[in-house]
């Protein structure tokens, strides 16, 4: 098994299918300037003027505002881009690497999005929501479709249903074949586990949303953070647990748009 430090930041959807056009209206693509505005991470619209993503996507060495854009929900990457400028990048102050935790960041858009049925916000969960195993949860993104296998053109948004796993079970799995002592937590309280050997997020999905349907409402349970490989045995995907950071999020993001 890989030694600690070899855990990968997540990039794509394994074992999923193309998302229906009508679903996941909060999904966004983060773009970095280069020969073209290249997709490098996912994100979610949590307020008309705010995007939630992973800190490792934009930090710890924060990019220039001039180097970053946000693309709202589109079925195929690059086909109908309308890139939005960002006015502020806020990385959680405790973030250092994804494996240590606090892998969460906020992007403030220069102008609020015109919400519609096609593009609108996702609901953040109440602090009391634990997202127990068995809950129907999905992860979405434009990332790799397998280890070192890129999403092919026309780069459709993909979705996969992933099983939630309790943290203590997930932590035990991550200790199998690892150099980390059993007394040292790998999967921390601010993390959430989901996925198995057939269904997982992967490189390129980082920062994107893990959403679960609770009483008829889609709630964002997690932010795609890290894992060892993609859909590997005993290595579920690790997500930043949104409920753990609600106070921090609402320090910046208004509760009611």
């Amino acid at each position: 098994a890989p030694a600690p430090g070899q855990a990968l930041q997540r990039v794509g959807i394994v074992g999923g299918q193309e998302a229906p056009r009508s679903k996941w209206p909060w999904q966004v693509s983060l773009r970095v300037h280069g020969p073209y505005w290249m997709h490098f991470c996912g994100g979610s619209l949590i307020h008309p003027q705010w995007v939630l993503t992973a800190a490792h996507c934009v930090g710890p060495d924060v990019k220039d505002l001039a180097a970053l854009r946000v693309q709202l929900r589109e079925q195929h990457l690059y086909y109908q881009d309308q890139l939005l400028p960002v006015s502020r990048i806020i990385v959680h102050p405790q973030f250092y690497t994804a494996q240590i935790g606090a892998d969460i960041a906020l992007l403030e858009l220069e102008e609020p999005v015109n919400v519609s049925s096609h593009v609108h916000t996702v609901t953040l969960p109440p602090a009391s929501e634990t997202f127990p195993p068995g809950m129907p949860c999905w992860v979405t993104g434009w990332g790799d479709v397998d280890n070192d296998e890129r999403l092919p053109p026309p780069f459709p948004l993909k979705q996969v249903k992933v099983p939630i796993m309790e943290n203590h079970i997930c932590d035990a799995k991550y200790h199998l074949g690892a150099y980390t002592g059993d007394d040292v937590r790998i999967v921390r309280d601010d993390m959430l586990c989901a996925g198995n050997t057939r269904r997982d997020s992967c490189q390129g999905d980082s920062g994107g949303p893990l959403v679960c349907k609770v009483n008829g409402t889609w709630l964002q349970a997690g932010v795609v953070s890290w894992g060892e490989g993609c859909a590997q045995p005993n290595r579920p995907g690790i997500y930043t647990r949104v409920t753990y950071y609600l106070d921090w999020i609402h320090h910046y993001v208004p509760k009611k748009p």
Epitope: D61, V62, D64, A66, A67, P85, E110
Partner: antibody, heavy 119, light 106 residues
Amino acid sequence: EVKLVESGGGSVQPGGSRKLSCAASGFTFSDYGMVWVRQAPGKGLEWVAFISSGSSTVYYADTMKGRFTISRDNPKNTLFLQMSSLRSEDTAMYYCARRDNYDWYFDVWGTGTTVTVSS
Amino acid sequence: QIVLTQSPAIMSASPGEKVTISCSASSSVTYMYWYQQKPGSSPKPWIYRTSDLASGVPARFSGSGSGTSYSLTISSMEAEDAATYYCQHYHSYPLTFGAGTKLELK
């Protein structure tokens, strides 16, 4: 022709107020972020304020925060800078400039308007 | 806020001479922008995103750098290049300019 023309400069007493205007023409004003930049006599350029295309985002230089207000009237293609509690160190040439939408440099500049703060 | 320090503050160069103006940032930025200003005129965009020349800028100009260290270079000084050059970042707000480098013709 893409053009920015500032107006409203003049002499004002310390503690007084002044409102500068910048008339834009030759482009779709409402599509662009805009800035004010000033230059004291014999000194360098100093960024003053930014306003996004639809006015939702505004930022100011620390020394101007609370005293200056940037605003815009998109239907009238005009950018404004309301200045209050003026000090002698605010004496400068004030330029408005357009931010390029793709590369974010200030691609179009006005000719400037002079504000002199003196008793 | 990010402080940009330009050096030298003033310099003179003979026609045909190679000129390098430096801009150092107090913390890392992705890109640097440069503007040229001549006395009595508004600033003009000169170099954007570190190395791209603005429209109408002669090919003898170039820009380079990364992190905290950036520079503007003139491969062969000409009389019309005499001006003050300012660097500027767009990393985060507040935006800042360098204090400027006045380039004179020797």
